[in-house]
C-alpha cells in the first residue's frame, strides 16, 4: 500500500524512497503508530524467568511478566527480583508480591 | 527559497504550559511531513515530534508523549506544538524541520525559539 | 533507541587539511545516516543522507561514507567556513543523532 499523507500506518515501516508501506512481519517485527520507520521495530523475547503474557503482533510488541514470587522495580526494568519471603522484625505485611512490586512492609503500631 | 521561522518560545515555570508555532514559506507546506527537533544548553539534538502532511497522523518519542502535541493549519501554511507539563529538562532551542522529498530525514530546519523551564 | 556516537567532541585542523569524522551506530542502520553542519549561532543545515549523498548545494569537498555501524564525514581542502559542529544522525528507526564533534581551525 502507499503511505497516507506521508507515514505509514501501525504494522508498517516505509520503504526506502517513501512510495510503499511494507508489512512488519508477525512474531519478529512491529510498529504500534504511524511512523516512517525505515524498519519495524524488533520484538522483545521474554528472559529467563519471566512469562509471556502475550505475544507479538505487527502492531503491538510482546507483554512479559515477571514469574510467581519476583517482580521487576522501576528503578531496574532489566530484572525480575525475588520478593521477600516476610517482613523484618517490628514490622508487619501490608500488601503482597506481585509482579511489579516486592511485599509491603510497614512498622507495628506500638 | 525555503523559509520557517518560529515563534512563541519564553520563560516557563515547571509544570507550566506554552504554544510553539512555525510559519512556513517558499514551498508547497500540505505536502510535507513536518517535525520537531529541540537542542538542549549541551547542545545535544532530540527529536520530539512528527505530523503527516495532511495532518492526520503523528508520532512522539516517549519522553513527550501524553505531554506534547504535534498540529498543523496547512491553510495558514503553519505547524505548531503545543506543550503541557514542562519539565526543566524541557528547556532549549526548539527547531521545527522539513521531511525532505525521498529522503526521510530532516532536509530544512527553521532558525529556532527557545524553552527555558526554570522557577 | 540506537545510539549514535560520536567519540570526538572536538576535532583540529588547518586550512587545506583533510579530516574525517566518524560516526557508530549502536546497532545496524544500513545506510539511513545524515550529516548535519551546525555553525555558530545558526541551526543545523543538511550535508549527507543516505550515508553518501550530497544535498542540494554542499560542496564536493563533503563526502560521506560508511553502512551498517560505522560512518564518515570526510571533508577534504578545508576552508575557514567549515569551522562549526557537525552533528551525525540515523532515521532508520525513529530519528537519533550523535553527540556533535567540533571542528576547530588552527
Known amino acids: 500500500s502507499s503511505p497516507s499523507e506521508g507515514l505509514c500506518p501501525p504494522g508498517h515501516h516505509i520503504s526506502e524512497d517513501g512510495r510503499d508501506c511494507i508489512s512488519c512481519k508477525y512474531g519478529q517485527d512491529y510498529s504500534t503508530h504511524w511512523n516512517d520507520l525505515l524498519f519495524c521495530l524488533r520484538c522483545t523475547r521474554c528472559d529467563s524467568g519471566e512469562v509471556e503474557l502475550s505475544p507479538c503482533t505487527t502492531t503491538r510488541n510482546t507483554v512479559c511478566q515477571c514469574e510467581e514470587g519476583t517482580f521487576r522495580e522501576e528503578d531496574s526494568p532489566e530484572m525480575c527480583r525475588k520478593c521477600r519471603t516476610g517482613c523484618p522484625r517490628g514490622m508487619v505485611k501490608v500488601g503482597d508480591c506481585t509482579p511489579w512490586s516486592d511485599i509491603e512492609c510497614v512498622h507495628k503500631e506500638s | 527559497e525555503v523559509m520557517l521561522v518560529e515563534s512563541g518560545g519564553g520563560l516557563v515555570k515547571p509544570g507550566g504550559s506554552l504554544k510553539l508555532s512555525c510559519a512556513a514559506s517558499?514551498?508547497?507546506?500540505?505536502?510535507?511531513?513536518m517535525s520537531w527537533v529541540r537542542q538542549t544548553p549541551e547542545k545535544r539534538l532530540e527529536w520530539v515530534a512528527t505530523?503527516?502532511?495532511?495532518?492526520?497522523?503523528?508520532y512522539y518519542p516517549d519522553s513527550v508523549k501524553g505531554r506534547f502535541t504535534i498540529s498543523r493549519d496547512n491553510a495558514k501554511n503553519t505547524l505548531y506544538l503545543q506543550m503541557s507539563s514542562l519539565r526543566s529538562e524541557d528547556t532549549a532551542m526548539y527547531y521545527c524541520?522539513?521531511?525532505?522529498?525521498?529522503?526521510?530525514?530532516?532536509?530544512?530546519w527553521g532558525q529556532g525559539t527557545t524553552l527555558t523551564v526554570s522557577s | 533507541d540506537i545510539v549514535m556516537t560520536q567519540s570526538h567532541k572536538f576535532m583540529s585542523t588547518s586550512v587545506g587539511d583533510r579530516v574525517s569524522i566518524t560516526c557508530k551506530a549502536s546497532?545496524?542502520?544500513?545506510?539511513?545516516v545524515a550529516w548535519y553542519q551546525q555553525k555558530p549561532g545558526q541551526s543545523p543545515k543538511l550535508l549527507i543522507y543516505?550515508?553518501?549523498t550530497r544535498h542540494t548545494g554542499v560542496p564536493d569537498r563533503f563526502t560521506g561514507s560508511g553502512s551498517g555501524t560505522d560512518f564518515t564525514l570526510t571533508i577534504s581542502n578545508v576552508q575557514s567556513e567549515d569551522l562549526a559542529d557537525y552533528f551525525c544522525?540515523?532515521?532508520?528507526?525513529?530519528?537519533?543523532f550523535g553527540g556533535g564533534t567540533k571542528l576547530e581551525i588552527k
Open positions: 524541520a522539513r521531511r525532505g522529498d525521498s529522503m526521510i530525514t530532516t532536509d530544512y
Open positions: 546497532q545496524d542502520v544500513g545506510t539511513a
Open positions: 505530523i503527516s502532511s495532511g495532518g492526520s497522523y503523528t
Open positions: 544522525q540515523q532515521y532508520s528507526s525513529y530519528r537519533t
Open positions: 543516505w550515508a553518501s
Open positions: 517558499g514551498f508547497t507546506f500540505s505536502s510535507y511531513v
